[in-house]
Amino acid sequence: CKAMHVAQPAVVLASSRGIASFVCEYASPGKATEVRVTVLRQADSQVTEVCAATYMMGNELTFLDDSICTGTSSGNQVNLTIQGLRAMDTGLYICKVELMYPPPYYLGIGNGTQIYVIDPEPCPDSDF
């Protein structure tokens, strides 16, 4: 059958600097040359788009300049990094992959990666 499966890790812990990285891998049913990757955040049944990028196979992902996401691609694998995360950003981050060209179009949606963000404790004042 022709369907697209998307795999991503179940859980990721953001670094103390508020950076989280995870791999989004898709099993392509066709030979796509143009792929769109979107990161969605689901929290309290609300869904928001975190970032999106379209790339040509073999080229790098290009997110908008003001995006909190960066990424690299290798074959059917996308390495995504989300920056500037705070504790309030903890939630389920879903990888959505669309094979845009050539036809036919295919949609694939991962089960989501639960990203936990813990705000660092403020450094205590010290006298020297």
Epitope: A3, R36, L40, V47, M100, Y105
Partner: antibody
């Protein structure tokens, strides 16, 4: 609020052309794929065409390929369907619909009626 | 092209009854991308269920979807007067996007 509003329907003779429009509001238009879906009187839903995001990628149903052209103007938050060489079997209510975050068609317009008759 | 078949064509029930609508796909693989819509006369369709089993925003919990592979079900646990309508299943995982012929739920 989030809504889609179609316009431009009417009665047209076979072989002639018509352009219908869909005005979007309440959401970031360029972040969504938008579809045209039609429904002939007393019949089911038939997908017609979709245009994705920046407008470069478009797909059509075989029944309209080569006759219909879907386009969008993201600066005006508007979707279009140019229908040429119209046939009696194109008579239907035409709906525009948004491809939601998870892909399903989550927002629909009220529809515009297109009647092809001599 | 994925062909969707719905059964029965018409379901005659009374308010308070349980309604079970079936949708069968000609090929598997679209299970994550199967939606159900409700349409009342003179109105546009309304999304009820996406991803085979997830309720859309604002949809009452008497509506539930289930199934995988090629067989899918929409269940309305207790029919309310406003639930009498036509219901369509649709796959949106690959183009061309296809819908079933619909099941009409009418009052017995």
């Amino acid at each position: 609020q989030v809504q889609l509003v179609e316009s431009g329907g009417g009665v047209v003779q076979p072989g002639r052309s018509l352009r219908i429009s869909c005005a979007a509001s309440g959401f970031t238009f360029s972040s969504y794929g938008i579809h045209w879906v039609r429904q002939a009187p007393g019949k089911g839903l038939q997908w017609v065409a979709v245009i994705w995001y920046d407008g470069r990628n478009k797909y059509y149903a075989d029944s309209v390929k080569g006759r219909f052209t879907i386009s969008r103007d993201n600066s005006k938050n508007t979707l279009y369907l140019q229908m040429n060489s119209l046939r009696a079997e194109d008579t239907a209510v035409y709906y525009c619909s948004r491809s939601g975050s998870f892909g399903a068609f989550d927002i629909w317009g009220q529809g515009t009626m297109v009647t092809v008759s001599s | 092209e994925i062909v969707l078949t719905q059964s029965p064509g018409t379901l005659s029930l009374s308010p308070g009854d349980r309604a079970t609508l079936s949708c069968r796909a000609s090929q598997s693989g679209s299970s994550s991308y199967l939606a159900w819509y409700q349409q009342k006369p003179g109105q546009a369709p309304r999304l009820l269920i996406y991803g085979a089993s997830s309720r859309a925003t604002g949809i009452p919990d008497r509506f539930s979807g289930s199934g995988s592979g090629t067989d899918f079900t929409l269940t309305i646990s207790r029919l309310e007067p406003e639930d009498f309508a036509v219901y369509y299943c649709q796959q949106y995982g690959t183009s061309p996007f296809t819908s079933g012929p619909g099941t009409k739920v009418d009052i017995k």
